[in-house]
């Protein structure tokens, strides 16, 4: 995500429009406590990070409260007073939505409607993945709102479901992150189950963004 400057690689994650995490990997400075300085306005003085992430006892990132912030993060990673990486980035391009909340299942014969609370901002896709013990891989369906109906299910089979949220690529670009998955929920004959008996540990989901 970050071009290298003096061998510094950066990663930015904007958690649900609330918190920004900037991490760095700087092999040249692996035993050095680099400092992180930032501002949200191009004309303000830099503030220093107050919430560092540590790796093997050295600074490796910063967590910033970015609620009510709506645009560009200007930042500088420094070795003492010497900047080793300076950049500005529109934060929205690194959005990671929060995991779906209040996931509910409504069954009607061979179909289920999966709903959850829509996030407060738009241009998102709500993806449901599901499989039965007889499926070799996860099936997927997504909608613009958290109201996804899956038809053609076999009422006698047990199905595992989980849900996540993704930012639409044509709006937010290719560098966003899907949310974490919701917990796996298992259903059979319209009733919740502890697990689908024949299913071992669920396989890795498809990594489609």
């Amino acid at each position: 995500q970050g071009g290298a400057a003096e061998g510094v690689q950066i990663q930015i994650i904007y958690f649900n429009l609330e918190t920004v995490q900037v991490t760095w990997n700087a092999s040249k400075y692996s035993r050095t406590n680099l400092t992180f300085h930032y501002r949200f306005n191009g004309d303000e003085a830099y503030d220093q990070c107050t919430n560092y992430l540590l790796q093997e006892g050295h600074t490796s990132g910063c967590l910033l409260d970015a609620e009510q912030r709506d645009d560009i993060l200007y930042f500088s990673i420094r070795n003492g007073t010497h900047p080793v990486f300076t950049a500005s980035r529109w934060m929205v391009y690194y959005l990671k939505p929060s995991s779906p909340k209040h996931v509910r299942f409504s069954w009607h014969q061979d179909a289920v409607t999966v709903t959850c609370s829509d996030l407060s901002y738009g241009d998102l896709l709500y993806e449901v993945q599901y499989r039965s013990p007889f499926d070799t891989e996860w099936q997927s369906k997504q909608e613009n709102t958290c109201n996804v109906t899956i038809e053609g299910l076999d009422a006698e089979k047990c199905y595992s479901f989980w849900v996540r949220v993704k930012a639409m690529e044509d709006v937010y670009g290719p560098d966003t992150y899907p949310s974490d998955w919701s917990e796996v929920t298992c259903w059979q004959r319209g009733e919740i189950r502890d697990a689908c008996a024949e299913t071992p540990t669920p396989p890795k989901p498809k990594l489609s963004k």
Epitope: D70, W90, D123
Partner: antibody, heavy 125, light 106 residues
Framework: QVQLVQSGSELKKPGASVKVSCKAS????????ISWVRQAPGQGLEWMGW????????RYAQGFTGRFVFSLDTSVSTAYLQISSLKAEDTAVYYC??????????????????WGQGTLVTVSS | DIQMTQSPSSLSASVGDRVTITCRAS??????LAWYQQKPGKAPKLLIY???TRGSGVPSRFSGSGSGTDFTLTISSLQPEDFATYYC????????FGQGTKLEIK
């Protein structure tokens, strides 16, 4: 359809002030941010900053703080650019441009699909 | 700032020609690049965003490519209405534009 209509050309003396307006129609004004872009005669395009039409929060690019003020009147779906203490080097066409894709609840992202027709501000004694 | 450098600064071509304009960013901007067309006395018009996605109503003869620091805008077969100035713009950081490429009739 989306339209941004700007106020007419202005001729001002050095030291004076000017206020350029940008009236939006064809969409919900508070849903998308408005940027201001400057183009000096025969020159390229320069982003001046943007204003969040939902919160009213202005953000100024480096070099456009102090004499430049972005404001809004959401009741008439209009954004304003005011420049005070005008100098000869402020002579330029000023454009308003609407954020293309990202809604104000999220912020902005610097892509401009819709533009006003431009307002020429000439500063001369 | 991220500097955007366009080349050439001007070029002459004929109707029907294939034309390529290049844009180089001073640092990696991934695919966060737009191309605009501007005619004299008019506002810029968005042609391409995400380096290769055509804007609404933009003819298919316009195409964009590139990623990282090097980008191109190609007009496959020039039409009379295509003679204008073209600007690239990065939106990875706060927006900056290239200096423009003036496309003139030969």
């Amino acid at each position: 359809q989306v339209q941004l209509v700007q106020s007419g050309s202005e001729l001002k003396k050095p030291g004076a002030s000017v206020k350029v307006s940008c009236k939006a129609s064809g969409y919900t004004f508070t849903s998308y941010g408005i940027s201001w872009v400057r183009q000096a005669p025969g020159q390229g395009l320069e982003w001046m900053g943007w204003v969040n039409t939902n919160t009213g929060n202005p953000r100024y690019a480096q070099g456009f703080t102090g004499r430049f003020v972005f404001s809004l009147d959401t009741s008439v779906s209009t954004a304003y650019l005011q420049i005070s203490s005008l100098k000869a080097e402020d002579t330029a066409v000023y454009y308003c441009a609407r954020e293309g894709f990202i809604r104000t609840v999220v912020g902005a992202a610097g892509r401009f699909v819709y533009w006003g027709q431009g307002t020429l501000v000439t500063v001369s004694s | 700032d991220i500097q955007m450098t366009q080349s050439p600064s001007s070029l002459s071509a004929s109707v029907g020609d294939r034309v390529t304009i290049t844009c180089r960013a001073s640092q990696d901007i991934h695919t966060r690049l737009a191309w605009y067309q501007q005619k004299p006395g008019k506002a810029p018009k968005l042609l391409i965003y995400w380096a290769s996605t055509r804007g609404s109503g933009v003819p298919s003869r316009f195409s964009g490519s590139g990623s990282g620091t090097d980008f191109t805008l190609t007009i496959s077969s020039l039409q009379p209405e295509d003679f204008a100035t073209y600007y690239c713009q990065q939106y990875s950081a706060y927006p900056t534009f290239g200096q423009g490429t003036k496309l003139e009739i030969k």
